[in-house]
Interface confidence: medium
């Protein structure tokens, strides 16, 4: 549609997992010269923030400071750009970005089977467990933007556990896991102690990437 600008990009610095009481910068940017940026948080504690765009080297951007992090600041964020004042017309929304607060509950334990040091090509499974009745476990690898997510299994020997099969080992890395409850998907536990997985053989940098969240495509956007 004529006059409707393509979606801007939304990034979290240093990342989308934010410890309780810490601050995250959500940067909305585009190569379209937007005068205004809006950052919208969906859900129970919805809110809309506004910043004037900064322009440099053909890029427009706005840095939204979110924090100190609390439960009501976690959620799904999208940003929009606006070029003109008359009529107020928003760009299509950015892809959604889920901001998660961590450090709320006791940390789970993370272990590797058959062990943290494996031969290249050998299958390895990471297990996350806790005595807390977490519904979900989330596994992150240092340097990766996305986490793998698995439902916790039934209680066994007093713990709730999820197994993350990494398949034939081709890469090492530092892993952490978090627990969360079904009713509060943006509120995670403290991180497990980091687990260094070492692969003896040829390391590569592939990591099973979970499917991207579906982005909301934009109708023409407008403000009243």
């Amino acid at each position: 549609h004529e006059g409707v600008h393509r979606k801007p990009s939304l990034l979290a610095h240093p990342g989308r997992l934010v410890k309780s009481e810490e601050t995250v910068i959500l940067q909305c940017w585009s190569d379209v010269r937007f005068e205004h940026f809006l950052l919208h948080r969906e859900g129970k504690f919805k809110d809309t923030l506004h910043l004037i765009g900064e322009h440099h080297d053909g890029v427009s951007k706005a840095n939204f400071s979110i924090g100190p992090m609390m439960q009501d600041l976690a959620g799904t964020y999208r940003c929009y750009g606006s070029v003109t004042h008359s009529p107020y017309q928003l760009s299509a929304p950015s892809d959604p970005l889920d901001i998660v607060i961590t450090g709320l509950y006791e940390k789970p334990s993370l272990s590797a089977q058959p062990g943290p040091t494996v031969l290249a090509g050998e299958s390895v499974t990471l297990s996350c467990s806790s005595r807390s009745s977490y519904d979900m476990y989330h596994l992150s690898r240092e340097g990766e933007a996305h986490e793998c997510r698995f439902s916790a299994g039934p209680k066994v020997n007093g713990t709730f556990q999820a197994d993350f099969p990494l398949g034939p080992a081709t890469h090492g890395g530092t892993y952490r896991c978090f627990g969360s409850f079904r009713d509060s998907p943006y509120e995670w536990s403290n991180s497990s102690d980091p687990l260094l997985v070492s692969v003896t053989g040829n390391p590569s940098n592939s990591w099973p990437s979970p499917t991207e969240p579906s982005s909301k495509t934009g109708n023409p956007r407008h403000l009243h």
């Epitope: 809006l38 919208h40 107020y88 109708n219 009243h224």
Partner: antibody, heavy 120, light 113 residues
Amino acid sequence: QVQLVQSGAGVKKPGSSVKVSCKASGGTFSSYAISWVRQAPGQGLEWMGGIIPIFGTSNYAQNFQGRVTITADESRNTAYMELSSLRSEDTAMYYCARGELVDPDAFDIWGQGTLVTVSS
Amino acid sequence: QSVLTQPPSVSGAPGQRVTISCTGSSSNIGAGYDVHWYQQLPGTAPKLLIYGNSNRPSGVPDRFSGSKSGTSASLAITGLQAEDEADYYCQSYDSSLSGYVVFGGGTKVTVLA
């Protein structure tokens, strides 16, 4: 629950101005759009213009350009609509309405309306 | 004259189904803009009935439904009740106007005795 409470009815002389207020009680409207919509007796709804307090700017329907001014005082949670050079055909019920900036961008909350009568 | 065209009136007996059309053009509904519907009971302010073409706010009975196709939209009321007698307005946006928000002319729904 947010409510929009408008100022009371008034009778105005042709050629004069009227200023109607719209106060958000039970919440803020700074991150919403506030529009003004009028309805002449027995007629339909007509959008006059709107303001987005966080943008600090207003825009107006072509029919009202130059005659209407929409402002907001964030500290008072109040929006204002001033219509000048009044004529008899401006006799109408004037409503303020709140719209989300993003989905759903419909007018989800309306004021109770302010009846403005223009008569000599 | 309104940018969006609605029939001036429709009527039906209690329990019947009535539909109200809202016809626009390629610069408003046909451009992909959402359509919203409002109900205005006699002597009261308009109330949001359907938003985003087909979504009902909480508290609106599921007898009311909305749809959109091409350059037009429609509102359907099934199981018509006496309290549904009111004026109904569609609303969208128009990229060719600086008067950006546009309404239909309104449709009076009469519930026959």
